[in-house]
Amino acid sequence: MMTGTIETTGNISAEKGGSIILQCHLSSTTAQVTQVNWEQQDQLLAICNADLGWHISPSFKDRVAPGPGLGLTLQSLTVNDTGEYFCIYHTYPDGTYTGRIFLEVLESSVAEHGARFQIP
């Protein structure tokens, strides 16, 4: 039975050229996190494996940094980075939990962080 919930940074915005931290947190479950995948649409950005640590996809190595924690830091943002990002938690014995973050990369300096929200 899956009892956990994923809390994410929700809808966020950041300035072009800047950086942003994508964060998800799994709570309300005692399940063991075996791996966390970060994806943009269906493109893999990075994997954090409990055994093996971080693996960053080669095409994102220059602009993606692991952490903090199980989060992911995107650097040198461009307008093309606007879109949906997903944290996918593989856990045992619960199974797979997914969190969604929408990032908007703005040309100007009016970027503000959106409210936090939860996805069951």
Partner: antibody, heavy 119, light 107 residues
Framework: EVMLVESGGGLVKPGGSLKLSCAAS????????MSWVRQTPEKRLEWVAT????????YYPDSVKGRFTISRDNAKNTLYLQMSSLRSEDTALYYC????????????WGQGTSVTVSS | DIQMNQSPSSLSASLGDTITITCHAS??????LNWYQQKPGNIPKLLIY???NLHTGVPSRFSGSGSGTGFTLTISSLQPEDIATYYC?????????FGGGTKLEIK
Amino acid sequence: EVMLVESGGGLVKPGGSLKLSCAASGFTFSSYTMSWVRQTPEKRLEWVATISGGGGNTYYPDSVKGRFTISRDNAKNTLYLQMSSLRSEDTALYYCARWLLTYYAMDYWGQGTSVTVSS
Amino acid sequence: DIQMNQSPSSLSASLGDTITITCHASQNINVWLNWYQQKPGNIPKLLIYKASNLHTGVPSRFSGSGSGTGFTLTISSLQPEDIATYYCQQGQSYPYTFGGGTKLEIK
């Protein structure tokens, strides 16, 4: 080329034990989560056990928990399945399989080794 | 455990046909659904992962769709080499479970 070659199957009496091996080549074995999956005589597929890349985490369905043990030797690029207290319902073709790095699906399977539990 | 019900259990079609195999999950599995192909006397091979993603080297005549509890595998322009049994598998929660298979034959 990714290759997975199972061995160790055979005929065993109910209550007996057997140890299966799977020799891996063509990829960085220690980076991949591995599983054993079996196919019954009726051709149904059943997940049997999973082990993480470093070997630190193992997972089983209730049907084999406490009877089967999955392990790996990354220095030898080999996956194992120790089976004990075998039952007739464990009769099957046992495959070892590699998971995608993303852990979404099993992308390569071995040819399988046959286990028959019968008196 | 999540039950995976595949239909039909067997299917006969002509070369060039478009066929659809369905897989129904007993509870919501989001997009965590994989399809495997097993040719006669051979081993299972991954076709589609995460409901709609074609695995490397799989011909584009194969496609997958669905989310939640209902999923489909579609093969367009059926070829002789597509004769096989097709299995769905859920990766949403443990224990991972497979459908009973759909045996595809050519008329």
